[in-house]
Amino acid sequence: QGGTRSPRCDCAGDFHKKIGLFCCRGCPAGHYLKAPCTEPCGNSTCLVCPQDTFLAWENHHNSECARCQACDEQASQVALENCSAVADTRCGCKPGWFVECQVSQCVSSSPFYCQPCLDCGALHRHTRLLCSRRDTDCGTCLPGFYEHGDGCVSCPTSTLGSCPERCAAVCGWRQMF
């Protein structure tokens, strides 16, 4: 009491850092610093992040919370997880759509847009890999269809149509003229 030197940070526990005159306990995630502690090893005055803002980590210096991001509707993004006091909104794509990164070196924070997944069924193909982080990977033609050019063509239903070699192998027809 009555001294003039501010104390060194030798408080019990490791979550004290110097803020101004004193070593203070920081604010937990989801809270911002309203005022630093007023005595050695004291608790700072921390307030909960207001709605639509967040702070993900314990902190000693943030006097305001970060604004939650809004998912980009123009890019067909949707909120997979709503923003909370401790975590930002997690944006992604709705079922049946996949993430297409807008930069070549893609990381989790990279800008992206959502693309509709290929519908293998509509292309008369097997689904080899379901669409999630990348587009659907379609496989071979469904039964009753054969490879022709880039697509799957329906097996002829009568002997009147022509059935090339690949058709014959799949559809069980010999080539007819």
Partner: antibody, heavy 116, light 107 residues
């Protein structure tokens, strides 16, 4: 709106005593450290004393140590400075100020004159 | 005690001028430095805390920079209402200490 209003200043003879008060409003007084800062006529600012939010920790400038006592009453939202054994060099405007790292709000000041 | 050396002690400038005041601490104070404006007969007003953070409502022509021992306060374009005395103050350590002030006047 944060407001700090000092009172209790006046003229006193050397060796005399005065008690300054600072009435706080517009904020949660019990969450903030408070200080007294003074300014002699035509001079710069000089920090005098500091008290923690709970009143449990007090600090003083060497020039007033042993003569001045800082205290607070959180129930009354009030800060005090008891000044004893006053000297001519204590003549100044005395400001109370709220500590939030820096001193972000100040009162208008009260003049203390120590003269025979 | 940490000694705060402010310079110049007074300066005269014209409206629109860029004005710079410096403050030097006798030891490292990190960024625990504030700047105040005091007009005659009034209480000091906090302009900048943590060396560079502008207080809410303070015009953007005021700015601060520096850390450690050397700090600068700048008014980018002097206005008539900026006539005042400016003080730096450290709050890294007790006792809290102020610079001796810089009196700013209009030419």
């Amino acid at each position: 709106e944060v407001q700090l209003v000092e009172s209790g200043g006046g003229s006193v003879q050397p060796g005399g005593s005065l008690r300054l008060s600072c009435a706080a409003s517009g904020f949660t007084f019990s969450s903030y450290g408070m200080s007294w800062i003074r300014q002699a006529p035509g001079k710069g600012l000089e920090w005098v004393s500091y008290i923690s939010s709970s009143g449990g920790h007090t600090y003083y400038a060497d020039s007033v140590k042993g003569r001045f006592t800082i205290s607070r009453d959180n129930a009354k939202n009030s800060l005090y400075l008891q000044m004893n054994s006053l000297r001519a060099e204590d003549t100044a405007v005395y400001y109370c100020a709220r500590y939030s790292g820096a001193f972000d709000h100040w009162g208008q000041g009260t003049l203390v004159t120590v003269s025979s | 005690d940490i000694v705060m050396t402010q310079s110049p002690s007074s300066l005269s400038a014209s409206v629109g001028d860029r004005v710079t005041i410096t403050c030097q601490a006798s030891q490292d104070i990190s960024n625990y430095l504030s700047w105040y404006q005091q007009k005659p007969g009034k209480a000091p007003k906090l302009l900048i805390n943590d060396a560079s953070n502008l207080e809410t409502g303070v015009p953007s022509r005021f700015s601060g920079s520096g850390s450690g021992t050397d700090f600068t306060f700048t008014i980018s374009s002097l206005q008539p209402e900026d006539i005042a005395t400016y003080y730096c103050q450290q709050y890294d350590n007790l006792p809290i200490t102020f610079g001796q002030g810089t009196r700013l006047e209009i030419k």
